[in-house]
């Protein structure tokens, strides 16, 4: 997501499943840290934001024509799973050890 | 990158290598279409923006707490190569059929 003046980085984002309506099927945990990618993708793009060639090109174009094109965006580039206890189709509590793509592992400029 | 009120999609972005200072080593082409990902990632995220679970979660949190967290971001999710004629370390013109990651193939919400 877009961010303030700091550079692109992973920050905490506590998510309560009740807040997003998922408590109807996720029994546990009640909340978890999804993390969020926050901050800007400023020139020059550092190695730690693992920029693609396209992101580098877009950053250079933005530098020359800031009104023509936006900066690259700070987004999750790697996600990790969480363990959840959920209600299956029959309403039976079922443990899923690895519910993929729920938490940010790494952020980068894309 | 962030966009206006339209939904996340791929749009044309003509890039002239002279504008970004790459004409010093890329002989041809003089310019190409890098494309750009533009538009918003609005609720509900459509299938065509191939949202990750994290992007869905972040969108739902943004819906409930718009000041706490930003929307997911419209970014390239698949890149494609271009062919370039470039000067190698010895200054010899060399053809690279597939210079990877230079052009947007698909956009999505992340």
């Amino acid at each position: 997501s877009t961010g303030a003046s700091s550079h692109c980085q992973k920050t905490s984002l506590r998510v309560n499943f009740e807040d997003i309506g998922w408590d109807s099927w996720i029994i546990a945990p009640k909340e978890y840290d999804a993390y969020e990618c926050k901050g800007g993708c400023f020139f020059p793009l550092a190695d730690d934001v693992t920029p693609t060639k396209h992101a580098i090109v877009q950053t250079l174009v933005h530098l020359k024509f800031p009104t023509k094109v936006g900066k690259a965006c700070c987004v999750p580039t790697k996600l990790s799973p969480i363990s959840i206890l959920y209600k299956d189709d029959m309403g039976v509590p079922t443990l899923k050890y690895h519910y993929e793509g729920m938490s940010v592992a790494e952020c980068g400029c894309r | 990158s962030t966009g206006a009120s339209s939904h996340c999609q791929k749009t044309s972005l003509r890039v002239n290598f002279e504008d970004i200072g790459w004409d010093s080593w890329i002989i041809a082409p003089k310019e190409y279409d890098a494309y750009e990902c533009k538009g918003g990632c609005f609720f509900p995220l459509a299938d065509d923006v191939t949202p990750t679970k994290h992007a869905i979660v972040q969108t739902l949190v943004h819906l409930k707490f718009p000041t706490k967290v930003g929307k997911a971001c419209c970014v390239p999710t698949k890149l494609s190569p271009i062919s370039i004629l470039y000067k190698d370390d010895m200054g010899v013109p060399t053809l690279k059929y597939h210079y990877e990651g230079m052009s947007v193939a698909e956009c999505g919400c992340r």
Epitope: I27, A28, P29, K30, Y32, D33, S80, P81, I82, S83, L85, P93, T94, L95, K96, Y97, H98, M102, S103 | -
Partner: antibody
């Protein structure tokens, strides 16, 4: 400091009942999975089952389903493993272990173990 | 018999590199993550590797994990006398957690 402290060694006779405990401290006990693992003398590790203390939700290994009961009392941050009728083959070291916060399949902290001996 | 298969024993001299294999099937290792534990004599197991290749803080980088298909392996470089222990792999199979039979690592000399 995260700690799991298990109850002391037990010597019991076949047919007797038993409840061993595992007290967690130094972390939010209710929001981490607790697993139980058996190790028979000179043998490897066997997963018995797991509990989520917040709602006392449990999942058992098919090998241990109906043989043992896993429970928890979140008010005192303690998990339990119990038998209604012990057998000689239940003689083993029993470990409780805490699942990593978002990964119930990896146990990052372990109790010191409780040795259970069942002999007539 | 364990669901995951490990060699009963491996050995190596101090300073050497040793690997311990763990073989499973598509329903466990093939489709899920692998963890590795070290159990020193007379002590409780200790988590060495989780999610195939991640090390908890405090675990030396001499220990590394990898996974390919339905098999996984633990590599220990710069073998030290204190590495002599039993090593167990584990994975999940549906709702259940499964362990390998364990491998005894002997440090020679």
């Amino acid at each position: 400091e995260v700690q799991l402290v298990q109850s002391g060694a037990e010597v019991k006779k076949p047919g007797e009942s038993l409840k061993i405990s595992c007290k967690g401290s130094g972390y939010s006990f209710t929001t981490y999975w607790i697993g139980w693992v058996r190790q028979m003398p000179g043998k490897g590790l066997e997963w018995m089952g797991i509990i989520y203390p917040e709602g006392s939700y449990t999942t058992y290994s098919p090998s241990f389903q109906g043989q043992v009961t896993i429970s928890a009392d979140k008010s005192i941050s303690t998990a339990y493993l119990q038998w209604s009728s012990l057998k000689a083959s239940d003689t083993a070291m029993y470990y409780c272990a805490r699942g990593k916060r978002v990964d119930a399949s990896s146990f990052d902290y372990w109790g010191q173990g409780t040795l259970v001996t069942v002999s007539s | 018999q364990s669901v995951l298969t490990q060699p009963p024993s491996v050995s190596g001299a101090p300073g050497q590199r040793v690997t311990i294999s763990c073989s499973g099937s598509s329903s466990n290792i093939g489709d899920n993550y692998v963890s590795w534990y070290q159990q020193l004599p007379g002590t409780a197991p200790k988590l060495l590797i989780y999610r195939n290749n991640k090390r908890p803080s405090g675990v030396p980088d001499r220990f590394s994990g990898s996974k390919s298909g339905t098999s996984a392996s633990l590599a220990i470089t710069g073998l030290q006398a204190e590495d002599e222990a039993d090593y167990y792999c584990s994975s999940t199979d549906k709702e259940h957690l499964v362990f390998g039979g364990g491998t005894k690592l002997t440090v020679l000399g």
